[in-house]
Amino acid sequence: SGRGEAETRECIYYNANWELERTNQSGLERCEGEQDKRLHCYASWRNSSGTIELVKKGCWLDDFNCYDRQECVATEENPQVYFCCCEGNFCNERFTHLPEAGGPEVTYEPPPTAPT
């Protein structure tokens, strides 16, 4: 029984490689999947000496290890690319690294949108 999952319909979208892949650089992505399959949001990034380099954000297909995650939290110690996924609209806006070995928790907030 999949009880009480947050339905994911839209995610924050970002692609650092947007020019090469001929996509938008950022925005919102409406998630589309097969009937009866769950959808998630994800974020991926690199951390070069404390400098965060966002790689991609968007929708993520049904993945059991993403079920019931309300927040986007990466736990791998020191990967080449950090990854997290979550359930709920725009849940990938913020993302966190909380290493399993008990290092410091680091949360990455999106930059505030400039006033128009």
Epitope: G4, D36, Y67, D68, F83
Partner: antibody, heavy 118, light 110 residues
Framework: EVQLLESGGGLVQPGGSLRLSCAAS????????MSWVRQAPGKGLEWVSG????????FYTDSVKGRFTVSRDNSRNTLYLQMNSLRAEDTAVYYC???????????WGQGTLVTVSS | QTVVTQEPSFSVSPGGTVTLTCGFN?????????PSWYQQTPGQAPRTLIY???TRSSGVPDRFSGSILGNKAALTITGAQADDESDYYC??????????FGGGTKLTVL
């Protein structure tokens, strides 16, 4: 080092019950989904059940629905499988497995043997 | 009911190449099913070889590779060795918390 250690198997009569446990160490248990997979003697692997990181979502193969219940205690780093109304066809080695992103089983326990026989 | 099919048995000569396949009765296997492959020797727990179609698990030799061939997932072993003689299982994640294992392939190296 990731370790998964199953226990609780044994000989039980048809209609009886058993509770299997899987003690996890070497990783942060609460951060990963878990699953049970079984293997009848001389047969192939069969997925039995899965449970999400919080325990809020549980799933079963059709043949055990209504008889088996999967649960987890994240404070004790332990996964459970409560097996009721056992049948001869449930005789198998039961493995617990850690689930990682892209829904694969990245670590396996050594298994515990459940024998259902009168 | 979904049935995942594998060749029941396969033989390969030492140093040869073999491709095991994994299909199912409800259509084509694609990357969205996150195909994964496991090796098992008698009396042992399964060992993870390939996940997410084509990613080798840590410590797995590069003679093992995964792919999609036509409408099936495939595991290719190049330069087969005697200790590759094992049972090989594919698994498809069907979504909604459900996995289905193939029946397994018994690989003989002779």
């Amino acid at each position: 080092e990731v370790q998964l250690l199953e226990s609780g198997g044994g000989l039980v009569q048809p209609g009886g019950s058993l509770r299997l446990s899987c003690a996890a160490s070497g990783f942060t248990f609460r951060n990963d989904a878990m699953s049970w997979v079984r293997q009848a003697p001389g047969k192939g692997l069969e997925w039995v059940s899965g449970i999400s990181v919080t325990g809020g979502s549980t799933f079963y193969t059709d043949s055990v629905k209504g008889r088996f219940t999967v649960s987890r205690d994240n404070s004790r780093n332990t996964l459970y499988l409560q097996m009721n109304s056992l049948r001869a066809e449930d005789t198998a080695v039961y493995y617990c497995a850690k689930v990682y992103y892209t829904s694969f089983f990245d670590y396996w326990g050594q298994g515990t043997l459940v024998t259902v026989s009168s | 009911q979904t049935v995942v099919t594998q060749e029941p048995s396969f033989s390969v000569s030492p140093g040869g190449t073999v491709t095991l396949t994994c299909g199912f009765n409800s259509g084509s296997v694609s990357t969205s099913y996150y195909p994964s492959w496991y090796q098992q020797t008698p009396g042992q727990a399964p060992r993870t070889l390939i996940y997410n179609t084509n990613t080798r698990s840590s410590g797995v030799p590069d003679r093992f590779s995964g792919s999609i061939l036509g409408n099936k997932a495939a595991l290719t072993i190049t330069g087969a060795q005697a200790d590759d003689e094992s049972d090989y299982y594919c698994v498809l994640y069907m979504g909604s918390g459900i996995w289905v294992f193939g029946g397994g392939t018994k690989l003989t190296v002779l």
